[in-house]
C-alpha cells in the first residue's frame, strides 16, 4: 500500500496522527468496527499531550477510546503496552462494576466529562474517536 502523508478530509492532524471525532453514539464494538473500516483504530492515548489534545476536542462528553479488558487484562487495540503506558483513570476506577443491572461487569474504557477515564458497559452508545498514524502504509492499492 501507499504511505499516507496527510489526513483525510474532516480528520484532525496532531503529532503525526490523524483523529476523527464522532458526533453520534455507538456501542464500543460498533465504534471499534467503524474505525477499522476507515483503516484506523479507536484512539490510543500514549502521552500527556495526546490526552490534552483529545480532551480539548471531545469536551465534557463520555467518549470511547481503544482500551478494553474483555479478554482479561486491559489491552490497547493497537498493541501498545498497557502496564507501562500512560493512564488517566478516575479515582477508584476501573472497578468492573456489576451493579448497573445490565449483565456482566464493565470492560470498555471511555473519557468522562473531566477527561479522566472510567470503565463502563461496552454496549452503551457513547461517542468515539478514531486515530490513524501518518507514515503508515494504507490498505489502499497504489495508483498505477
Amino acid at each position: 500500500g501507499s504511505e499516507r502523508t496527510c489526513c483525510p478530509v474532516n480528520w484532525v492532524e496532531h503529532e503525526r496522527s490523524c483523529y476523527w471525532f464522532s458526533r453520534s453514539g455507538k456501542a464500543w464494538a460498533d465504534a471499534d468496527n467503524y474505525c477499522r473500516l476507515e483503516d484506523a483504530h479507536l484512539v490510543v492515548v500514549t502521552s500527556w499531550e495526546e490526552q490534552k489534545f483529545v480532551q480539548h476536542h471531545i469536551g465534557p462528553v463520555n467518549t470511547w477510546m481503544g482500551l478494553h479488558d474483555q479478554n482479561g487484562p486491559w489491552k490497547w487495540v493497537d498493541g501498545t503496552d498497557y502496564e507501562t503506558g500512560f493512564k488517566n483513570w478516575r479515582p477508584e476506577q476501573p472497578d468492573d462494576w456489576y451493579g448497573h443491572g445490565l449483565g456482566g461487569g464493565e470492560d470498555c474504557a471511555h473519557f468522562t466529562d473531566d477527561g479522566r477515564w472510567n470503565d463502563d458497559v461496552c454496549q452503551r452508545p457513547y461517542r468515539w474517536v478514531c486515530e490513524t498514524e501518518l507514515d503508515k502504509a494504507s490498505q489502499e492499492p497504489p495508483l498505477l
Epitope: W48, E49, Q51, K52, H56, K87
Partner: antibody
Framework: QVQLVESGGGVVQPGRSLRLSCAAS????????MHWVRQAPGKGLEWVAI????????YYADSVKGRFTISRDNSKNTLYLQMSSLRAEDTAVYYC???????????WGQGTTVTVSS | DIQMTQSPSSLSASVGDRVTIACRAS??????LNWYQQKPGKAPKFLIY???SLQSGVPSRFSGSGSGTDFTLTISSLQPEDFAIYYC?????????FGGGTKVEIK
C-alpha cells in the same frame, strides 16, 4: 479546611540528599494528583514534578530528572520528594500543591526552604 | 519545552485602573493556560484555569482570555490587595512551564 503542610527543608551540602514531606488534610488525598514546585530566592516559579492520585504516572522537570523522586503514601495522606545529588541551584522554597485537571494547582502549602551550601 | 513569555515584566498602576498582562507561548497550547497571583513571602494563589475560567472565590474583576499562543489576564478595576506578582502557566505539555512573572506595583 483544606491544608497542605511541607516539612523537611534545611541546609545541606552539595552532593547530599534530603527528603521533603507534604502532609495533606481536609480533602480526600487519594483522589488528587500532587505537584512539587520551587522558587529560588528572588526568582519565579519552577515546576518540579507531578504524581497521579494513584501513582500511575510521574513526570519531572529536566533539571531534576534522575536526581529527584516524587512519591506518595495515600494511607498517610503524605506526599514526598526525595532529593539526591543536590546542587547549589536547587536552593529554593519548595511548595507542594494539589493538582486540578492535569497541571493546574488549586491548593498550595506554605513552602519549606532548602539551602544547598558548603 | 514550551517557553512562556510574559509582558510587561513590571508595571505601575493606580487603584481603579484597568490592568492587562500578556502571556505568549512558544507553541500552540490550545487553551491550557492558568494564571496565579503571588504576594511577598506567600504561596501562589490560583486565579484562572483553561485560559478563561475563574477559580471559585476569585473576584469577578479578574478575567482571562486567549487561545493558541496569546493570552491575557485583565483586572478591570485594580484594588489595593491586587498589588502582587502574576504568573501564567501552561499545562498542555510536560515539563509544565511558568512565565517569568509580571509585578504589579503601586504608582
Amino acid at each position: 479546611q483544606v491544608q497542605l503542610v511541607e516539612s523537611g527543608g534545611g541546609v545541606v551540602q552539595p552532593g547530599r540528599s534530603l527528603r521533603l514531606s507534604c502532609a495533606a488534610s481536609g480533602f480526600t488525598f487519594s483522589s488528587f494528583g500532587m505537584h512539587w514546585v520551587r522558587q529560588a530566592p528572588g526568582k519565579g516559579l519552577e515546576w518540579v514534578a507531578i504524581i497521579w492520585h494513584d501513582g500511575s504516572n510521574k513526570y519531572y522537570a529536566d533539571s531534576v530528572k534522575g536526581r529527584f523522586t516524587i512519591s506518595r503514601d495515600n494511607s498517610k495522606n503524605t506526599l514526598y520528594l526525595q532529593m539526591s545529588s543536590l546542587r547549589a541551584e536547587d536552593t529554593a522554597v519548595y511548595y507542594c500543591a494539589r493538582d486540578l485537571s492535569m497541571g493546574g494547582m488549586d491548593v498550595w502549602g506554605q513552602g519549606t526552604t532548602v539551602t544547598v551550601s558548603s | 519545552d514550551i517557553q512562556m513569555t510574559q509582558s510587561p515584566s513590571s508595571l505601575s498602576a493606580s487603584v481603579g485602573d484597568r490592568v492587562t498582562i500578556a502571556c505568549r507561548a512558544s507553541q500552540n497550547i490550545i487553551s491550557y493556560l492558568n494564571w496565579y497571583q503571588q504576594k511577598p513571602g506567600k504561596a501562589p494563589k490560583f486565579l484562572i484555569y483553561t485560559a478563561s475560567s475563574l477559580q471559585s472565590g476569585v473576584p469577578s474583576r479578574f478575567s482571562g482570555s486567549g487561545s493558541g499562543t496569546d493570552f491575557t489576564l485583565t483586572i478591570s478595576s485594580l484594588q489595593p490587595e491586587d498589588f502582587a506578582i502574576y504568573y501564567c502557566q501552561q499545562t498542555y505539555s510536560t515539563p509544565l512551564t511558568f512565565g517569568g512573572g509580571t509585578k504589579v506595583e503601586i504608582k
